[in-house]
Interface confidence: medium
């Protein structure tokens, strides 16, 4: 399934954002984890820029396995919410938030779920959505992100993520894979790729490729457990590299490199 919606107005919209069940008014969304950079930031309002700002180059640069390679893939994993589920609910979490791997190397986007009742196997669905905004462009040119951020922050929504939260009609949406029991089915676009759902609900790519950059949503559906936080997402960025220089987007904190 591929949906290529193309709007002509503002690049951000009223996306779904975080999924908190309405019956849990006491359960606040977990704030996004932003990572700081030095005084050059100059902009207190750049909540999203902080996602791009800091030290991936410092974390990655000294790793010998990274030198001289053509590209790297950076996976930024983000829990959409974090709260205790009530009875008869699903709790989906994305853990191990940092993966830096070489292009064409494997990567696993970890996802686990807990259910309060398990009479039937739930369906695990991994869905891909392209970024709402160009992370690289915003990292290189912070002015291009300011206007939209200012509007959102002025509306009292400092947790707004302009790269993830927008209407599906203005981005590409695809089902990557689904799993029920031991049966894994790849979406049409991913047929022929060595991609599978392993373990509890982890999405594993044998080889990452150009075009894999985007937001990956892990959702778990069960007829018995209708409440709860049944979705979490991971951001995956495929980046080109200068040979011998491990400078990527200015600002992600690097996790371990998988080679």
């Amino acid at each position: 399934m591929q949906q290529d919606g193309l709007g002509v107005g503002t690049r951000n919209g009223s996306g779904k954002g975080r999924s908190v069940h309405p019956s849990w008014p006491w359960c606040a969304p977990r704030p996004l984890r932003y990572f700081g950079r030095d005084a050059r930031a100059r902009r207190a309002q750049t909540a999203a820029m902080a996602l791009l700002a800091g030290g991936l180059s410092r974390g990655l640069g000294s790793h010998p396995a990274a030198a001289g390679r053509d590209a790297v893939v950076f996976v930024w994993l983000l829990l959409s919410t974090w709260c205790t589920a009530p009875a008869r609910a699903i709790q989906v979490t994305v853990s191990n938030p940092y993966h830096v791997v070489i292009l064409f190397q494997p990567v696993t986007l970890p996802c686990t779920y807990q259910m309060t009742s398990t009479p039937t196997q739930p369906i695990v669905i991994w869905k891909y959505k392209s970024f709402c905004r160009d992370r690289i462009a915003d990292a290189f040119s912070p002015a291009s992100v300011d206007n939209q951020l200012n509007a959102q922050l002025a509306a009292g929504n400092p947790g707004y993520n302009p790269y993830v939260e927008c209407q599906d009609s203005v981005r590409t949406v695809r089902v990557v894979a689904t799993k029920q029991g031991n049966a894994v089915t790849l979406g049409d676009y991913y047929q022929g790729r060595r991609i599978t759902i392993t373990g509890n609900a982890d999405l594993t790519f044998d080889q990452t490729a150009w075009g894999d950059s985007g937001v990956y949503y892990c959702s778990v559906v069960s007829a018995q457990d209708l409440q709860g936080n049944n979705e979490a997402y991971a951001e995956l960025i495929v980046l080109g590299r200068t040979s011998g220089v491990a400078e990527l987007l200015p600002g992600f904190q690097a996790g371990p490199i998988e080679d």
């Epitope: 590209a71 040119s141 002015a143 980046l239 990527l248």
Partner: antibody, heavy 115, light 109 residues
Framework: EVQLVESGGGVVQPGRSLRLSCAAS????????MHWVRQAPGKGLEWVAV????????YYADSVKGRFTISRDNSKNTLYLQMNSLRAEDTAVYYC????????WGQGTLVTVSS | QTVVTQEPSLTVSPGGTVTLTCASS?????????PTWIQQKPGQAPRALIH???YKHSWTPARFSGSLVGDKAALTLSGVQPEDEAEYYC?????????FGGGTKVTVL
């Protein structure tokens, strides 16, 4: 009004060096990434290099990697391209372009590498 | 080596419609490649028309529109004017690298 003015082009022998400049005005230069793009005579556009708003991150096309260096001086609102070990195939008009979507372009400066 | 492919040339009548396409050797072009379309007239510097697949600059005439068609990025000129005769370049972003297509020469006859 946004203006980008390239300079520094000329005729140079193979193996020699040249430094191009791009003077920017009409926008907050220090807030935007900048590109260099070139066009050989009668040919298409070729991306050369990009630099982030603060100069901390740079990317290069494979064809110039290790020979060309992109830099900027935000206090002077100027973008630079240092070109070393020039080859005949580097002969082209060199353009600077603003932001990563290349919304504004300069008029270009011609670099001719010839013995 | 990544290659971006465009039609070498297309001919259109004044008032007609023409669609230029842009393909990537790496597979389907999606919005994640942030397709950009640039126009260049003979003897002039390039000028950006469309960015991020379909977004127009303030100076872009309404008759130009960008989209994704199948596995390609597309630029459609509707109600073509004589002044639209030019070379049109597609630009795709591959992480930290930008690749231009070879350009499409649009002739208005």
């Amino acid at each position: 009004e946004v203006q980008l003015v390239e300079s520094g082009g000329g005729v140079v022998q193979p193996g020699r060096s040249l430094r191009l400049s791009c003077a920017a005005s009409g926008f907050t230069f220090s807030s935007y990434g900048m590109h260099w793009v070139r066009q050989a005579p009668g040919k298409g556009l070729e991306w050369v290099a990009v630099i982030s708003y603060d100069g901390s991150n740079k990317y290069y096309a494979d064809s110039v990697k290790g020979r060309f260096t992109i830099s900027r001086d935000n206090s002077k609102n100027t973008l630079y391209l240092q070109m070393n070990s020039l080859r005949a195939e580097d002969t082209a008009v060199y353009y600077c372009a603003k932001d990563l979507n290349m919304d504004y372009w300069g008029q270009g400066t011609l670099v001719t590498v010839s013995s | 080596q990544t290659v971006v492919t465009q039609e070498p040339s297309l001919t259109v009548s004044p008032g007609g419609t023409v669609t230029l396409t842009c393909a990537s050797s790496t597979g389907a072009v999606t919005s994640g490649y942030y397709p950009t379309w640039i126009q260049q007239k003979p003897g002039q510097a390039p000028r950006a028309l469309i960015h991020t697949t379909s977004y127009k600059h303030s100076w872009t005439p309404a008759r130009f529109s960008g989209s994704l068609v199948g596995d390609k990025a597309a630029l459609t000129l509707s109600g073509v004017q004589p002044e639209d005769e030019a070379e049109y370049y597609c630009l795709l972003q591959y992480g930290g690298a930008w690749v231009f297509g070879g350009g499409t020469k649009v002739t208005v006859l």
